[in-house]
Interface confidence: medium
């Protein structure tokens, strides 16, 4: 029994996939695909605004954490990387690039530095940082 | 211009994918797909033999490191996890489950414990460990 048919238009062959297996994506070439979301880790250090612009130029946004279950690959991420979370001083809330508010219990926010942007660190931690500080960053593209 | 057509047999719809985007896999459901390899990180601690058996039961093997370029997602992996590397005392070499010898300069082998198995740690390090010690583990399935 086969669950899907992938039509490879280049060779015009059908590749059959077992029910337990599936394709992931589509994602930009050489990005990580997990539970139909696309992720890429960028080594070069940029400030938050430059990181955001870099993701946008690739039709993506900075990392948005929306589910510990769907994004459990983030548990094991080493080091610190810009994500798309910013502090809104007027109401004191933390919100994502798309305007949605950070859900409670998703991230442990750690306020060591003074700042309005946040770095993602393993085990769903968010470290507040000055937005002008250069850091590596994670871009994300949702496919669903 | 579109690079591929994915035929969704459930809804019988064609989804067009830009040239710069592609599907990854196929992989077991909810595994990580990267450069057409499938990876899964398992939280439960098992000894090396149990970890190997767990991967095999999922039609996969313990992690094999074969390319820093194709597997650069492994740079950022936190913690220590069994991989498919074992020491062959008769000739002193390190080899993978498939019998191939560890290529030079792929891993930095660090002899912390006396043992014949190896844990993967970030930035392409391999920590020697007693094969009977319980650890988390990484399974891998190559799709190409």
């Amino acid at each position: 029994i086969w669950s899907a048919v992938f039509l490879n238009s280049l060779f015009n062959q059908e590749v059959q996939i077992p029910l337990t297996e599936s394709y992931c994506g589509p994602c930009p070439k050489n990005w990580i695909c997990y539970k139909n979301n696309c992720y890429q880790f960028f080594d070069e250090s940029k400030n938050w605004y430059e990181s955001q612009a870099s993701c946008m130029s690739q039709n993506a946004s900075l990392l948005k954490v929306y589910s510990k279950e769907d994004q459990d690959l983030l548990k094991l991420v080493k080091s610190y990387h810009w994500m798309g979370l910013v502090h809104i001083p007027t109401n004191g809330s933390w919100q994502w690039e798309d305007g949605s508010i950070l859900s409670p219990n998703l991230l442990t926010i750690i306020e060591m530095q003074k700042g309005d942007c946040a770095l993602y660190a393993s085990s769903f931690k968010g470290y507040i940082e000055n937005c002008s500080t250069p850091n590596t960053y994670i871009c994300m593209q949702r496919t669903v | 211009i579109w690079s591929a057509v994915f035929l969704n047999s459930l809804f019988n719809q064609e989804v067009q994918i830009p040239l710069t985007e592609s599907y990854c896999g196929p992989c077991p459901k909810n595994w990580i797909c990267y450069k057409n390899n499938c990876y899964q990180f398992f939280d439960e601690s098992k000894n090396w033999y149990e970890s190997q058996a767990s991967c095999m039961s999922q039609n996969a093997s313990l992690l094999k490191v074969y390319s820093k370029e194709d597997q650069d997602l492994l740079k950022l992996v936190k913690s220590y996890h069994w991989m498919g590397l074992v020491h062959i005392p008769t000739n002193g070499s390190w080899q993978w489950e498939d019998g191939s010898i560890l290529s030079p300069n792929l891993l930095t082998i660090i002899e912390m414990q006396k043992g014949d198995c190896a844990l993967y740690a970030s930035s392409f390090k391999g920590y020697i460990e007693n094969c009977s010690t319980p650890n988390t583990y990484i399974c891998m399935q190559r799709t190409v």
Epitope: Y80, I110, E111, M112, Q113, K114, Y127, N130 | -
Partner: nanobody, 120 residues
């Protein structure tokens, strides 16, 4: 330029107390987390504690928890390390530093160091 000037070290008996100070200048003190690091004779650097910019969050190395307290006075641009129940193994050169090595590993400015000797 960034300057961190330390004071308050000295000789103390086991079980005694000392308070170290670190006066900061040349930067906006309350923008930064701060840390204490020490180096025992013939040993490498050992992280002691870190404190957030506001002083609301502190972290300590396991062996110092309950004995050492890090605080700061942002109005005075000064960082403090209160050391109680001192042991001979606390003998070291103590440094204050800008940043939070426990969290980010980035200490970009250091004090001159102050010697603490615990001996009877």
């Amino acid at each position: 330029q960034v300057q961190l000037v330390q004071s308050g070290g000295g000789l103390v008996q086991p079980g005694g107390s000392l308070r170290l100070s670190c006066a900061a200048s040349g930067f906006t003190f309350d923008d930064y987390a701060m840390s204490w690091v020490r180096q025992a004779p013939g040993k490498g650097l050992e992280w002691v504690s870190a404190i957030s910019w506001s002083g609301r969050t502190t972290y300590y190395a396991e062996s110092m928890k309950g004995r050492f307290t890090t605080s700061r006075d942002n109005a005075k641009n000064t960082l403090y390390l209160q050391m109680n129940s001192l042991k001979p193994e606390d003998t070291a050169l103590y440094y204050c530093a800008r940043g939070d090595v426990a969290i980010r590993g980035n200490l970009d400015a250091w004090g001159q160091g102050t010697q603490v000797t615990v001996s009877s």
